[in-house]
């Protein structure tokens, strides 16, 4: 791989607390690091067909670290796509231009030296402009395995023309079965996207009991589908301490 | 080479409807392109009016949205705009032109003029 | 809406530098593309993708893009090259695309 400049050309302030070199002494080694990591908190990239994909991983280290790119964990080669593609090393970028649908997947940005290795996915989907199902950033919601007491936040990201209704769910028991008569599983509604909800995509739970363990969902629907994603939260208390009861209302997922 | 070429009226009425199309030659517009119209009021700088893709899908400037309608007929490898309750503001060199991210193909442009 | 800035007017005496601006929120992580308009012409692209020269440009045309502001740079000014520059880019938030207002090049003597 060709080295990038050291410089980041997306780096306005000049905040690095490496030491400058001097003619005697030799840079002290730093580990690769995000440079703009705020540039990067967008993962789930939704794109119509033909336009131009850039992904950007802007980093530093020392010695200058080497920049590569994977397409769903595996390594990405210019012929693996028609047209190829560009890697702008001077800018840590990656460019696909005129996208087609075969373009979707997980792009994976690897930054490494000697002294370490960072690494960060792009989502990218290839979509028509015209209404669609609703898409979800993968991976999220996030597992989280919290102390009992604590407040817990579940985030769902989601792209979706027309405007999605959003809900928030848990998998419950009823009767010791966590599954209805009808072979669907029992659920609770949590939260549900109002007209103006604007927090919708996160759940927050507050001051977490043992009870509250379990898989939480994440429900996206439009009038064209649905999507949903879960997670699984996790509260650790002391041995000693009793079981809180449990309160429900049982609905049924379908 | 694509080539692109207005055609229609250059006087249309206030309150009235502008309707142009693009005949494309050299190219299928059916190809992995987007079909755009883009307008220049004299002496002034360049507008996106919309676009669209082979399949019907559209997207429209917003703030000319609720006049225009972008149409797209394969069998004749042309596209069409209509702009309606046109005024005097509307008087502009109406261009053509191909597109990805970038546009890479323009027709020669077509003046039109809004006046009673 | 997504705005791209300009300055209006950039001079340049033959055969010095000229560098038009846009600038726009975080531009550096959107696909700058830049176009010459000659009067009563058609606009034709010389930088697309930030800083590629569609075939048959002059490599005296360059781009470059970073943080807030996209640059053009025309080194070795000819009178030629007198037109108004515009830049574009599709914002991928709103899924328009926009042009900058436009820069008139005017090469001096």
């Known amino acids: 791989d060709a080295l990038p400049s050291s410089e980041d050309d997306d780096d306005d302030d000049d905040s690095s607390s490496e030491e400058k070199e001097t003619d005697n002494t030799k840079p002290n080694p730093v580990a690769p690091y995000w440079t703009s990591p705020e540039k990067m908190e967008k993962k789930l990239h939704a794109v119509p067909a033909a336009k131009t994909v850039k992904f950007k991983c802007p980093s530093s280290g020392t010695p200058n670290p080497t920049l590569r790119w994977l397409k769903n964990g595996k390594e990405f080669k210019p012929d693996h796509r028609i047209g190829g593609y560009k890697v702008r090393y001077a800018t840590w970028s990656i460019i696909m231009d005129s996208v087609v649908p075969s373009d979707k997947g997980n792009y994976t940005c690897i930054v490494e030296n000697e002294y370490g290795s960072i690494n960060h996915t792009y989502q990218l989907d290839v979509v028509e402009r015209s209404p669609h199902r609703p898409i979800l950033q993968a991976g999220l919601p996030a597992n989280k395995t919290v102390a009992l007491g604590s407040n817990v936040e579940f985030m769902c990201k989601v792209y979706s023309d027309p405007q999605p209704h959003i809900q928030w769910l848990k998998h419950i028991e009823v009767n010791g079965s966590k599954i209805g008569p009808d072979n669907l599983p029992y659920v609770q509604i949590l939260k549900h996207s109002g007209i103006n909800s604007s927090d919708a995509e996160v759940l927050t739970l507050f001051n977490v009991t043992e009870a509250q363990s379990g898989e939480y969902v994440c429900k996206v629907s439009n009038y064209i589908g649905e999507a949903n994603q879960s997670a699984w939260l996790t509260v650790t208390r002391p041995a000693l301490e009793e079981r809180p009861a449990v309160m429900t209302s049982p609905l049924y997922l379908e | 080479q694509v080539q692109l070429q207005e055609s229609g009226p250059g006087l249309v009425k206030p309150s009235g409807t502008l309707s142009l199309t693009c005949a494309v030659s050299g190219g299928s517009i059916s190809s992995n392109n987007w079909w755009s119209w883009v307008r220049q009021p004299p002496g002034k700088g360049l507008e996106w009016i919309g676009e669209?893709?082979?399949?019907?899908?559209?997207s429209y400037n917003p703030s000319l949205k609720s006049r225009v309608t972008i149409s797209v007929d394969k069998s004749k490898n042309q596209f069409s705009l209509k702009l309606s309750s046109v005024t005097a503001a509307d008087t502009a060199v109406y261009y053509c032109?191909?597109?990805?991210?970038?546009?890479?193909?323009w027709g020669q442009g077509t003046l039109v003029t809004v006046s009673s | 809406s997504y705005v791209l800035t300009q300055p209006p007017s950039v001079s340049v005496a033959p055969g010095q530098t000229a560098r038009i601006t846009c600038g726009g929120n975080n531009i550096g992580s959107e696909s700058v593309h830049w176009y010459q308009q000659k009067p009563g012409q058609a606009p034709v692209l010389v930088v697309y993708d930030d800083s590629d020269r569609p075939s048959g440009i002059p490599e005296r045309f360059s781009g470059s893009n970073s943080g807030n502001t996209a640059t053009l740079t025309i080194s070795r000014v000819e009178a030629g090259d007198e037109a108004d520059y515009y830049c574009q880019v599709w914002d991928s938030t709103s899924d328009h695309r926009v042009f900058g207002g436009g820069t008139k090049l005017t090469v001096l003597g």
């Open positions: 669209i893709y082979h399949s019907g899908s559209t």
């Open positions: 032109a191909r597109a990805t991210d970038w546009f890479d193909a």
